[in-house]
């Protein structure tokens, strides 16, 4: 079925609400201050070979687990993450984005890299696909 | 029970190489850090380095740098400390400990009963 | 790296006394609302064990006798009575900047 409007305009926000969810959460760990980050930084993440279309989310969507245990970490009493629902909430935004009628075999990268790496990464991939929806 | 059982006293000759060992048992090993820490003789306590058991990733203190390598097995729930060089200033206690982190703490909950190592020629 | 003083460095106490014992950092242990200040408690050929972690909060199993105060720079370990089995060293650690450090003790010994 060839994108309408609306379904472009659906994606765009869900990949927009996305971006929001990785950027707040590398702006609360990614803080030479907190006194946890050395240690987060010793948790390490599995990267896509390839992250060019939607149907790459799926290696995003096998490192959600991954990712919800590191920042269970980061929380503090004026930094109120809630790792569980904000993981929740990003997977349900992904499994929309991906799709579920495909079923995609992710493939990774030899190298893994440090949660504030896979964070990047995957801003840059929503990034990616944003500019070219608009 | 939770315990992080360490291997035995030591007696090295400088320049002897040297690992040390800190069994965990009781929890899931590869889900938390392990850190270890020298006590030099009638001495207080100093941060050595950190790892994560499941990823094999390290952080050290600056001042032991080079000068000691910790690694672990996940496999067998053991961490290491080793030396490829012992030195006379490396007689000392060290502990493992296990690090908590979650919420708004970071602390040691769980430490091994020490390894003690005397370099002397 | 994070300096920790503690103080006194040694005293003598009878069991039933109220012990005191401060810890002075170099520079703030305080992020973010939360103090990263825990008390140990150290036994001559034993491995430090947990008394009291993010500076008030007591470890499960310690007695509530040990009490933890404090915030940014001051924090102040309290015991209210006393026991035998308290006579040991006690270390102050911050958890709040790497490298982690501890103070240089406080030996609690019989009067």
């Known amino acids: 079925m060839a994108p309408t409007s609306s379904s472009t305009k659906k994606t765009q926000l869900q990949l927009e609400h996305l971006l929001l969810d990785l950027q707040m959460i590398l702006n609360g760990i990614n803080n030479y201050k907190n006194p946890k980050l050395t240690r987060m930084l010793t948790f390490k993440f599995y990267m896509p070979k390839k992250a060019t279309e939607l149907k790459h989310l799926q290696c995003l969507e096998e490192e959600l687990k991954p990712l919800e245990e590191v920042l269970n970490l980061a929380q503090s009493k004026n930094f109120h993450l809630r790792p569980r629902d904000l993981i929740s909430n990003i997977n349900v935004i992904v499994l929309e984005l991906k799709g579920s009628e495909t079923t995609f075999m992710c493939e990774y990268a030899d190298e893994t890299a440090t949660i504030v790496e896979f964070l990047n990464r995957w801003i840059t991939f929503s990034q990616s696909i944003i500019s070219t929806l608009t | 029970e939770v315990q992080l059982v360490q291997s035995g006293a030591e007696v090295k000759k400088p320049g002897e190489s040297l690992k040390i060992s800190c069994k965990g048992s009781?929890?899931?090993?590869?889900?938390?850090?392990i850190e270890w820490v020298r006590q030099m003789p009638g001495k207080g306590l100093e941060w050595m380095g950190v790892i994560n058991p499941g990823s094999g990733g390290t952080y050290y203190n600056e001042k032991f740098k080079g000068q000691v390598t910790i690694s672990a097995d996940k496999s067998i729930s053991t961490a290491y400390l080793q030396w490829s060089s012992l030195k006379a200033s490396d007689t000392a206690m060290y502990y493992c400990?296990?690090?908590?982190?979650?919420?708004?703490?970071?602390?040691?909950?769980?430490w091994g009963q020490g390894t003690t190592v005397t370099v002397s020629s | 790296a994070i300096r920790l003083t503690q103080s006194p460095s040694s005293f003598s106490a009878s069991t039933g006394d109220r012990v005191t014992i401060t810890c002075k950092a170099s520079q703030s242990v305080d992020y973010q609302g939360d103090s990263y200040m825990n008390w140990y408690q150290q036994k001559p050929g034993k491995a430090p064990k947990l008394l009291i972690y993010?500076?008030?909060n007591l470890e499960s199993g310690v007695p509530s006798r040990f009490s933890g105060s404090g915030s940014g720079t001051d924090f102040t370990l309290t015991i209210s009575s006393l026991q035998s089995e308290d006579f040991a060293t006690y270390y102050c650690?911050?958890?709040?900047?790497?490298?982690?450090?501890f103070g240089g003790g406080t030996k609690v010994e019989i009067k």
């Open positions: 400990a296990r690090w908590r982190g979650e919420g708004y703490y970071a602390y040691y909950d769980v």
């Open positions: 650690q911050q958890s709040n900047e790497d490298p982690y450090t």
């Open positions: 009781g929890y899931a090993f590869s889900n938390y850090l």
């Open positions: 993010s500076a008030s």
